[in-house]
């Protein structure tokens, strides 16, 4: 014997008190899939949590964290604070890149200065904590007299700046 | 920098009512809900409910529904947690945390005596 | 509601000891797991939230790990410091739960 539930397709809840007929899910809640016999609370971004997906008959909320901090956890569970450009998230919180590398976003890690010289290139701007280096022509592409940029002592490996 | 400062120590009787203040500075407060947990004295910490600063939304704890009641007034970025019908297992130090799925600042604590 | 399950309850312990405390949930809380310390004066602090991430401030002595219901709190190299209470908390759904909390004392 086929069980009569189901037939009950998502968005709606196969209702015992009504003799199994299917039924809509109440307002906010949801099934997002069928033959279910109860429908589940809608989640509610609320505080540091945004809404960034209403919650519909068939799909629950999704949130998402207000400007200044960014999602962990499946389905933004948390929210944790962005750090400023220059800098990287550590296990001991937002830290300064080490010098030779350089973070240009608000999340992500510090990642190293481009090595002009492997392209055969020399340093047009230096690097800073925020920007990556800009590499210019080749040294012999240089006309006679012309200076390049110094180009930056040799990267130390990330995570072993002077404390 | 970040701060949560709650309202002083309170000896009531039983059957008696508590409110609980909890003024937030250094951050908008109307931007992170603001839970209350409580310990009783040699116990765990209970959760009791949160408040939702901007819309004042609650969720409250099951247990405590019937009796809690969590307020704001954005005005002066402060959270209110009433306790009614106060028993003497309601002796208990009640702290107010700010939440970002986890509870980054808490403040002192408050100190409820119940005694007859 | 999902029930945080603490060991042990109580750890006597020497300066430099390595310590580890663990926390059971009832149920797949998907890492979403904090640490707390209280010190004797009854301040709260936050530790690690999701499972490892040190909150700031935090000495990297501490560190957090697990998954789905099974989590530890360790101390690489215990501080005088470091005698407190410690708490783990599910933030999974609601309500929010706390373990029974682990008191480390100077052994």
């Known amino acids: 014997l086929q069980d009569p539930c189901s037939n009950c397709p998502a968005g709606t809840f196969c209702d015992n008190n009504r003799n199994q007929i299917c039924s809509p899910c109440p307002p906010n809640s949801f099934s997002s899939a069928g033959g279910q016999r109860t429908c589940d609370i809608c989640r509610q971004c609320k505080g540091v949590f945004r809404t960034r997906k209403e919650c519909s008959s068939t799909s629950n909320a999704e949130c998402d964290c207000t400007p200044g901090f960014h999602c962990l956890g499946a389905g933004c569970s948390m929210c944790e604070q962005d750090c400023k450009q220059g800098q990287e998230l550590t296990k001991k919180g937002c830290k300064d890149c080490c010098f030779g590398t350089f973070n240009d976003q608000k999340r992500g890690i510090c990642r190293p200065w481009t090595n002009c010289s492997l392209d055969g290139k020399s340093v047009l701007v230096n690097g800073t904590k925020e920007r990556d280096v800009v590499c210019g022509p080749s040294p012999a592409d240089l006309s006679p007299g012309a200076s390049s940029v110094t180009p930056p002592a040799p990267a130390r490996e990330p995570g072993h700046s002077p404390q | 920098q970040v701060q949560l400062v709650q309202s002083g120590a309170e000896v009531k009787k039983p059957g008696a009512s508590v409110k609980v203040s909890c003024k937030a500075s250094?951050?908008?407060?109307?931007?992170?809900?603001m839970h209350w947990v409580r310990q009783a004295p040699g116990q765990g910490l209970e959760w009791m409910g949160a408040i939702d600063p901007k819309t004042g939304g609650t969720d409250y704890n099951q247990k405590f529904k019937d009796r809690v009641t969590m307020t704001r007034d954005t005005s002066i970025s402060t959270a209110y947690m009433e306790l009614s019908r106060l028993r003497s297992d309601d002796t208990a130090v009640y702290y107010c945390a700010r939440d970002l799925g986890y509870f980054d600042v808490w403040g002192q604590g408050t100190l409820v005596t119940v005694s007859s | 509601d999902i029930q945080m399950t603490q060991s042990p309850s109580s750890l006597s312990a020497s300066v430099g000891d390595r310590v580890t405390i663990t926390c059971r949930a009832s149920q797949d809380i998907r890492s979403n797991l904090n640490w707390y310390q209280q010190k004797p004066g009854g301040a709260v602090k936050l530790l690690i939230y999701?499972?490892?991430r040190l909150h700031s401030g935090v000495p990297s002595r501490f560190s957090g790990s697990g998954s789905g219901t099974d989590y530890t709190l360790t101390i690489s190299s215990l501080q005088p410091e470091d005698f407190a209470t410690y708490f783990c908390?599910?933030?999974?759904?609601?309500?929010?739960?706390f373990g029974g909390g682990t008191k480390l004392e100077i052994r």
């Open positions: 908390q599910q933030s999974e759904k609601l309500p929010r739960t």
């Open positions: 999701y499972t490892s």
């Open positions: 250094g951050y908008t407060f109307a931007g992170f809900e």
